[in-house]
Interface confidence: medium
């Protein structure tokens, strides 16, 4: 079992190194910013031009492109729940410095947890996404 575990670790490590998780990070950041914007926006203020697409629509289109790319990358981890967890942890760690305040961090984490399902993939049943808990072993 140990030999298999070692090979599994190496395979996961090389998958993680090959994967480009940046689209996932961009998709999630845009998603939580879009949510914040829609909550923060005054519903009674008239739009500048009723015929031009709002910046939210434009950003939404970009985000769906990021999501598609992101899902393609995550698809590589579909058959390895442990490695899928590693990928999600990596996304969390990469973005943790850019998240402002506890609320944004919780929101990002919530969206990150839902990401595999959004991609039609199996989410790892258990996965520690706390970044405060110190550095992670990278095998």
């Amino acid at each position: 079992r140990q030999q298999w575990e070692l090979q599994g670790d190496r395979r996961c490590q090389s998958q993680l190194e090959r994967a480009n998780l940046r689209p996932c990070e961009q998709h999630l950041m845009q998603k939580i910013q879009r949510d914040e914007d829609s909550y923060g926006r005054d519903p009674y203020s008239p739009s500048q031009d009723p015929y031009s697409p709002s910046p939210y629509d434009r950003r939404g289109a970009g985000s769906s492109q990021h999501q598609e790319r992101c899902c393609n990358e995550l698809n590589e981890f579909e058959n390895n729940q442990r490695c899928m967890c590693e990928a999600l942890q990596q996304i969390m760690e990469n973005q943790s410095d850019r998240l402002q305040g506890r609320q944004q961090e919780q929101q990002f984490k919530r969206e990150l947890r839902n990401l595999p399902q959004q991609c039609g993939l199996r989410a790892p049943q258990r996965c520690d996404l706390e970044v405060e808990s110190g550095g992670r072993d990278r095998y």
Partner: antibody
């Protein structure tokens, strides 16, 4: 307040069967992951089995898989452990525990425990 | 069944601080949340810490948890004689699809 009351323990011969019950009250049973944990005399804690809120997913300790079956009846607020082909090494105090795992990413922690019931397998 | 490794025993005088370590691997502590339990003689275990660092209501802040990489630590400050008990860590192991408990640590409060 939360209560888990266990029953069904006792003395059984090797190869025999026993069914443990754990009656829950004071919380919404159908929303909690449930678990069985055992402790052999003078030894540490050993997890035995988990069952999801709706009973759809079950996990077992390797050494009991195929012999033990965890189940729940949410209408009766009761958790069960059917133990077949019992061995001397299954002798232990068995605890049922309610697991506060509300979403699937949280940890496996057991925040409410039954009083424990002794199962002795001996000829 | 593989285990999470804890020191068999620790001891300190009342009022002092102790830490109990729990060492695992990438498939358990490295990926999953850790919880800690206290078991007084002849009683059922009691949850002290969950999700690495959180305390259930009613658990004093003398008890704290932390996690780094594949190890977790329980800290107890201001030791009291009532803290004499066995302490266990626990987490999920992704490879075994099982919950693992630590080997257990007996805490003795001296004097």
């Amino acid at each position: 307040q939360v209560q888990l009351v266990q029953s069904g323990g006792g003395l059984v011969q090797p190869g025999g069967s026993l069914r443990l019950s754990c009656a829950a009250s004071g919380f919404k049973f159908s929303t909690f992951y449930m678990t069985w944990v055992r402790q052999a005399p003078g030894k540490g804690l050993e997890w035995v089995s988990n069952i999801k809120q709706d009973g759809s997913e079950k996990d077992y300790l390797d050494s009991v898989r195929g012999r033990f079956t965890i189940s729940r009846d949410n209408s009766k607020n009761t958790l069960y452990l059917q133990m077949n082909s019992l061995r001397a090494e299954d002798t232990a105090v068995y605890y049922c525990a309610a697991n506060g795992l509300q979403d699937s990413y949280s940890g496996d922690f057991f925040d409410h425990w039954g009083q424990g019931t002794l199962v002795t397998v001996s000829s | 069944q593989s285990v999470l490794t804890q020191p068999p025993s620790v001891s300190a005088a009342p009022g002092q601080k102790v830490t109990i370590s729990c060492s695992g691997t990438g498939s358990n502590i490295g990926h999953n949340y850790v919880s800690w339990y206290q078991q007084l003689p002849g009683t059922a275990p009691k949850l002290l810490i969950y999700d690495n660092t959180k305390r259930p209501s009613g658990i004093p802040d003398r008890f704290s948890g932390s996690k780094s990489g594949t190890s977790a630590t329980l800290g107890i400050t201001g030791l009291q004689t009532g803290d004499e008990a066995d302490y266990y860590c626990a987490t999920w192991d992704a490879d075994l699809s099982a919950v693992l408990f630590g080997t257990g640590t007996k805490l003795t409060v001296l004097g």
